[in-house]
C-alpha cells in the first residue's frame, strides 16, 4: 500500500502568509509574487549574480515536529544559466545548499548559522537559459531530501544563497506513515514510518470482526518501512464459522447456506435432507428421520439407516451353508454399508433355540462384513439354523430399529468326512477320516465302499463305528476308487468324495506309508 | 478601505528634527514590511528606508543613514519615521508605501504624501 | 545601480507607445512600474513577469529582455498623460531597490 504523507510546511499553499526570515534582510532572498491563471503564485528569489560573496540566508519559520522521526523535503525550484549573465559572471553559482536545525524552542528573529547542519547541495537537472526565461518558459526542478532521526520538538529549514540565480517555488515538508491497512481480513493501525532505512517497524495487526487467526497459523503481522509502505505479510485471519468474506470484512452466512470451520472457503448450501438454517448457521440441522454421523463433515447431506438387505438365500451343502445376499434398496444415502450376520439354532425335537455362535465356523469374521456372501460350516446335522443378516451404515447407531432379513436352513445330513490314505502295499491300503466333533455323536457307523477303477459292476462295503480301515486282498498295483459315508438313525449322511488310492506294485513291496 | 494616511510634514530649519507619522487600515498592518519614499520638488522618486513586518530589520538609503530613523507600532497600526539634522537637500514630499510581499515590494499602496520643506 | 528611463516620450491617442528601462539589475531581477498623475501619490501598474494589480486597465503590459524593461500602453488615451517610473530590486547590493529617472508620456 502506497505510504500516507502527514504535510508539516507547504510554502506554495501557503499564499506568502509564511513570513520565512531572510538574512541579510531585503538584499539576498526575497519573496516575490507573479500572477498565473488570475492565481497569485509565490516564491522566494535571489539574483545577486553579479556581486561576489554572497551569503543569503532564508530560514523558515519554526516546524513542529510532532510525530515525525525523519522528514522529506520536496523542493520545486528555478536556477536561470550563469552564462545568462556577461561574462558568464565569474562569481554566479547555479547551486544553493540546504541546512537544517532542531530545536525544542522558536528562536523568532534570532538567527544563527552555527547551529545549522547541511543537508546537500541542491543543484538543478535543468537551468533556464535566458532565451528560455524571456519566452516565460523556465524550467522547473524537483529535487527531494529526507533527515532523520529527529528527536527535538521542532525544527528549521534554511536556505544558503552563494551567489546563484535561483526561485524557490515549493517547498514541502512532509513525514511518512504506513496508512492504515485492511488486508488478510486483519487491521492494522496507521503507523508512522521509521527513521532508518532499513530498519521494518513490525506492526501487530488485529482481526477484523468475526475473522480468527486459524488454529496452528500465525498471528497478522506487517512490516512498516521508511518510505510509509507496508511489507511483508505475516500470517492472517479467517472469517469464522458462520461468516465468509466479502471484500475486507466477514459477513454472516445467509439464510440456507452455512459454514461449519474457520476457513477462506465461503458458506455452502445447506445439503440434502437438512432444515433450512438461520443467517450465520455454523452448520444445517438434519430433517427428521435423517442424522449425521460424528466424523460426517458438514457439508456433507443427511444420511438415514439403510433399509434390510434386499434378497437374501441360504443354500445347504451338507453341514455347510452359503449365505448370499444383495445390497439394500435404500443405502439411506450413504456408501458405508456393512453388513452383521447372526446365527440361531434350533432343536426339532423340543423346538428350543439358542445363539450358534460359538459353534459354529465362518468364512471371514460375521460382522461388519463389507461383502455380500458368506459361508458357515460346521453345522450339525438335523437341526434347523436362523440366519439373519443386518445392514448397517454410519449412522445406524443413532436409531434404535434395526433393518435385516432372515433365512432359515434345515440341516439334514452331517457333513462329508475327509478322508485320507495313511498306508499302502501291494495288496491293502489303509484309510482315514474325519468329521467335524459336534456331528461325531449323531453318527452310528461308518460305511466305506470301494471298487477296482473302470470296474463299474462290482464293488465292496465295509462298516465300522471306528475314523480307519485297512482294506485287505486288493490286487497289486492297481487303482481303487474310496468313499466314506456316515450313517446316522436318520439315515444316511453325506458321502466324502470319491478318492483314487493305488496298491503298491510287487517290486516296491512292504507297508509303506504315503 | 485599505489606505494609508499620513501626517506630521511641515516646514523645519536646517538641522532640525521633524516626526512623520502613516496611518494604515483596511488590512493587517503587522504582516507587511512597509517603506518611506521620496520626491524632491520636480524630480523623481528616491527610495529612503524600509522596515520588516515584526520591526527586526531596517534599512536605508546611504543619504539618510545615521540621520533617519524609520520604525513603527503594530498595535497602533503606524509607520514612522523620526527626521533629525535635517538638511535643504532632504525637502521632498514623503511618501509611505506597503511592499506587497517581501522585503522590496512592488508598492502597492501608498500615502497621500506630506511635505517637509528644510530651509532657513 | 541604477536605472535610465527616457525624459519623455509622446503618442498620439489611440496609439501604442512603450517606455524603456534600462540597468543591471533587470538581468536578476523583474520591474515594476508606477503612474504618477501631478499632485497625487505613485499608482503601482504592472509588476513580476507582467502582472497587473486589479483596476488597471489591460491596455498597460510589461515585458523584459536582457538589462531591459518595458512598459507597452496599447491604444493610449488622454487620461494615461503621467510621470511613469520603473522600479527594481538592486542585484548589486549596494541599495535595497531603484527606482529609474521617471519619464514624462504626453498624448498628444
Known amino acids: 500500500a502506497q505510504g500516507k504523507e502527514v504535510v508539516l510546511l507547504d510554502f506554495a499553499a501557503a499564499g506568502g502568509e509564511l513570513g520565512w526570515l531572510t538574512h541579510p534582510y531585503g538584499k539576498g532572498w526575497d519573496l516575490m509574487q507573479n500572477i498565473m491563471n488570475d492565481m497569485p503564485i509565490y516564491m522566494y528569489s535571489v539574483c545577486n549574480v553579479m556581486s561576489g560573496d554572497q551569503d543569503n540566508w532564508l530560514r523558515t519559520n519554526w516546524v513542529y515536529r510532532g510525530e515525525a522521526e525523519r522528514i522529506f523535503i520536496e523542493l520545486k525550484f528555478t536556477v536561470r544559466d550563469c552564462n545568462s549573465f556577461p561574462g558568464g559572471a565569474s562569481s554566479c553559482k547555479e547551486t544553493f545548499n540546504l541546512y537544517y536545525a532542531e530545536s525544542d524552542l522558536d528562536y523568532g528573529t534570532n538567527f544563527q548559522k552555527r547551529l545549522f547542519t547541511k543537508i546537500d547541495t541542491i543543484a538543478p537537472d535543468e537551468i533556464t537559459v535566458s532565451s528560455d526565461f524571456e519566452a516565460r518558459h523556465v524550467k522547473l526542478n524537483v529535487e527531494e531530501r529526507s533527515v532523520g532521526p529527529l528527536t527535538r520538538k521542532g525544527f528549521y529549514l534554511a536556505f544558503q544563497d552563494i551567489g546563484a540565480c535561483v526561485a524557490l517555488l515549493s517547498v514541502r515538508v512532509y513525514y511518512k506513515k504506513c496508512p492504515e491497512l485492511l488486508q488478510g481480513l486483519a487491521h492494522f493501525p496507521e503507523t508512522i514510518a521509521g527513521s532508518d532505512a532499513p530498519s521494518l517497524a513490525t506492526v501487530a495487526g488485529t482481526c477484523v470482526d468475526h475473522a480468527v487467526v486459524p488454529p496452528g497459523g500465525e498471528e497478522p503481522r506487517m512490516h512498516c518501512a521508511v518510505d510509509g509502505e507496508w511489507l511483508v505479510p505475516i500470517g492472517q485471519c479467517l472469517c469464522q464459522a458462520g461468516y465468509e468474506k466479502v471484500e475486507d470484512a466477514c459477513q454472516a452466512c445467509s439464510p440456507g447456506f452455512f459454514k461449519f470451520e474457520a476457513s477462506e472457503s465461503p458458506c455452502l448450501e445447506c445439503p440434502e435432507h437438512t432444515l433450512p438454517s438461520p443467517e450465520g448457521a455454523t452448520s444445517c440441522e438434519c430433517e427428521e428421520g435423517f442424522f449425521r454421523a460424528p466424523q460426517d463433515p458438514a457439508s456433507m447431506p443427511c444420511t438415514r439407516p439403510p433399509s434390510a438387505p434386499h434378497y437374501l438365500t441360504a443354500v445347504g451343502m451338507g453341514a455347510k451353508v452359503e449365505l448370499r445376499w444383495t445390497p439394500p434398496q435404500d443405502s439411506g444415502g450413504r456408501e458405508d454399508i456393512v453388513y452383521s450376520v447372526t446365527c440361531e439354532q434350533c432343536w426339532p425335537e423340543s423346538g428350543e433355540c439358542g445363539p450358534c455362535e460359538a459353534s459354529v465356523r465362518y468364512s471371514e469374521p460375521p460382522h461388519g462384513l463389507t461383502r455380500t456372501s458368506v459361508t458357515v460350516s460346521d453345522l450339525e446335522p438335523h437341526m434347523n439354523y436362523t440366519f439373519t443378516v443386518e445392514a448397517r451404515n454410519g449412522v445406524s447407531g443413532l436409531v434404535t430399529s434395526r433393518s435385516f432379513r432372515t433365512a432359515s436352513v434345515s440341516i439334514n445330513q452331517t457333513e462329508p468326512p475327509k478322508v485320507r490314505l495313511e498306508g499302502r502295499s501291494t495288496t491293502s491300503l489303509s484309510v482315514s477320516w474325519s468329521i467335524p466333533p459336534p456331528q461325531q455323536s449323531r453318527v452310528w457307523k461308518y460305511e466305506v465302499t470301494y471298487r477296482k477303477k473302470g470296474d463299474s459292476n462290482s464293488y465292496n462295503v465295509r462298516r465300522t463305528e471306528g475314523f480307519s480301515v485297512t482294506l485287505d486282498d486288493l490286487a497289486p498295483d492297481t487303482t481303487y476308487l474310496v468313499q466314506v459315508q456316515a450313517l446316522t438313525q436318520e439315515g444316511q449322511g453325506a458321502g466324502s468324495k470319491v478318492h483314487e488310492f493305488q496298491t503298491l506294485s510287487p517290486e516296491g513291496s512292504g507297508n509303506l506309508a504315503v | 478601505q485599505v489606505q494609508l494616511v499620513q501626517s506630521g510634514g511641515g516646514l523645519v530649519q536646517p538641522g532640525g528634527s521633524l516626526r512623520l507619522s502613516c496611518a494604515a487600515s483596511?488590512?493587517?498592518?503587522?504582516?507587511?514590511?512597509m517603506h518611506w519614499v521620496r520626491q524632491a520638488p520636480g524630480k523623481g522618486l528616491e527610495w529612503v528606508a524600509v522596515i520588516s513586518y515584526d520591526g527586526s530589520n531596517k534599512y536605508y538609503a546611504d543619504s539618510v543613514k545615521g540621520r533617519f530613523t524609520i520604525s513603527r507600532d503594530n498595535s497602533k497600526n503606524t509607520l514612522y519615521l523620526q527626521m533629525n539634522s535635517l538638511r535643504a537637500e532632504d525637502t521632498a514630499v514623503y511618501y509611505c508605501?506597503?511592499?506587497?510581499?517581501?522585503?522590496?515590494?512592488?508598492?502597492?499602496?501608498w500615502g497621500q504624501g506630506t511635505l517637509v520643506t528644510v530651509s532657513s | 545601480s541604477e536605472l535610465t528611463q527616457p525624459p519623455s516620450v509622446s503618442v498620439a491617442p489611440g496609439q501604442t507607445v512603450t517606455i524603456t528601462c534600462q540597468g543591471d539589475s533587470l538581468r536578476s531581477y523583474y520591474a515594476s512600474w508606477y503612474q504618477q498623475k501631478p499632485g497625487t501619490a505613485p499608482k503601482l501598474l504592472i509588476y513580476?513577469?507582467?502582472n497587473r494589480p486589479s483596476g488597471v486597465p489591460d491596455r498597460f503590459s510589461g515585458s523584459s529582455s536582457g538589462t531591459s524593461a518595458s512598459l507597452t500602453i496599447t491604444g493610449a488615451q488622454a487620461e494615461d498623460e503621467a510621470d511613469y517610473y520603473c522600479n527594481s530590486r538592486d542585484s548589486s547590493g549596494t541599495h535595497l531597490t531603484v527606482f529609474g529617472g521617471g519619464t514624462k508620456l504626453t498624448v498628444l
Open positions: 483596511g488590512f493587517t498592518f503587522s504582516s507587511y514590511a
Open positions: 508605501a506597503r511592499a506587497s510581499v517581501g522585503a522590496t515590494g512592488p508598492f502597492d499602496i
Open positions: 513580476g513577469e507582467n
